[in-house]
Amino acid sequence: TTSAEKNTCQLYIQTDHLFFKYYGTREAVIAQISSHVKAIDTIYQTTDFSGIRNISFMVKRIRINTTADEKDPTNPFRFPNIGVEKFLELNSEQNHDDYCLAYVFTDRDFDDGVLGLAWVGAPSGSSGGICEKSKLYSDGKKKSLNTGIITVQNYGSHVPPKVSHITFAHEVGHNFGSPHDSGTECTPGESKNLGQKENGNYIMYARATSGDKLNNNKFSLCSIRNISQVLEKKRNNCFVESGQPICGNGMVEQGEECDCGYSDQCKDECCFDANQPEGRKCKLKPGKQCSPSQGPCCTAQCAFKSKSEKCRDDSDCAREGICNGFTALCPASDPKPNFTDCNRHTQVCINGQCAGSICEKYGLEECTCASSDGKDDKELCHVCCMKKMDPSTCASTGSVQWSRHFSGRTITLQPGSPCNDFRGYCDVFMRCRLVDADGPLARLKKAIFSPELYENIAE
């Protein structure tokens, strides 16, 4: 086979007990893993990395640490208070030679607005990134640096899925060899030119993202140049040909009837686990209608749930999902009317998603309230609106000029929302905290390559 066909990066995804605690069930956790992987798969597949096309991702194996694993001494992620650098290191201390990349998903509020951390790949002579094998480092420990971590929490709030998906794409972008974007060509969101600015920054922007601007889920030319060099050199080391589904990864893929994982993970009475012989594994057991691995509308007794059963909670922008009685999948929810307030009145619903700014309800655009001299920053965490393409009219929702629309109500951004032109995130005290994007990885490099600087954690 030619190297051109080796285009699939196989992932090992682990989730810690806090991620499980937030999503509540194995099925919900698997759905999260699946949506994150699908999201980055779409981004990378549609990017031409200087002639290298159709880069895709496949989950090879998952490990879900449930709340029952919180006290398990073999679970490295059991500690409640771990900094982001240590959390990545705990992942890296495992041997991940069987995978292209290994990630841990968590629901922890790391310091300084950090949503993820990953080792940066390079074409040669550097440790870290895709296909990197486990080896001994100067701190005396064996480590796999084909790793990264992401969290779904920021300043006490949960980030929207689109932001979390971009965080995952961003961290994987580091593994693939891209540093943060810099320079005017690759940070258009920082431009003084309104036309350029309105499309936002690219995936590898160093600071904050809202996830809803045109460039937010695209790679910049800077990233493409860096990633293509790494792919050229490294992908033959561990990428595989795409095609076959992976029985045992917990996700029902084309060609599988069900997938409840390997025998040590499968708690399903309906599905043959991945350790079964070839003709049986990932197939429904005789006489069973469905498996819970197929979706939330299947009971533990392997039958479709009845027509009236709820399978998805009502959200700000969509009604609850109701099983239809003849499939395990939860049917799509009906959207609530466009311009319904959502995310605590800071945004509005657009086609069933909490996507637009509250400003759009009144034909205005969201903007950043920042004084030109940078002295008055008390409004950086207010929702601010302006007339379309007229930054001179930018003012807080609580301002005199928008009294007709907001009746003097100062609407503040949710903690964890981007602020000050995407330079930082709002904290719980409504202060805009700038992001130190490169600090954590620099500290971790120092720790691993100069062990005397390393502080161990206490259990």
């Epitope: 003012a395 301002s399 005199v400 000029q401 003097g408």
Partner: nanobody, 121 residues
């Protein structure tokens, strides 16, 4: 400490008139925007009218245009709302507010306790 005190509310028959006053103390508000807002039971607060420091910029909610008039007396540090042709739907608690600056971008940072206006049919 800035204080805004409303007065002049009460019970009035539909078609009648009332004049609300708002006295500001603790700071000279002659240079700042002043406004009136109202909140009916079970509803969100809504904008009624505002006036700039010089009186040169005035705006009204569509629902009160032509019936209500906002004015100010800088010497007395007081803003008024003259309400004519009152309707039952004007029933609400009326709040006086003062902005923190003299531009349209200033925020409404100071609020009174409110005065009840009830219009009976």
């Amino acid at each position: 400490k800035v204080q805004l005190v409303e007065s002049g509310g009460g019970l009035v028959q539909a078609g009648g008139s009332l004049r609300l006053s708002c006295a500001a103390s603790g700071r000279t508000f002659s240079r700042y925007y002043m406004g009136w807002f109202r909140q009916a039971p079970g509803k969100e607060r809504e904008f009624v009218a505002f006036i700039s420091g010089t009186g040169g910029s005035i705006d009204y909610a569509d629902s009160v245009k032509g019936r209500f008039t906002i004015s100010r007396d800088s010497a007395k540090n007081t803003v008024y709302l003259q309400m004519n042709s009152l309707k039952p739907e004007d029933t609400a608690v009326y709040y006086c507010a003062a902005a923190s600056g003299n531009s349209g971008r200033s925020t409404w940072d100071y609020w009174g306790q409110g005065t009840q206006v009830t219009v009976s049919s």
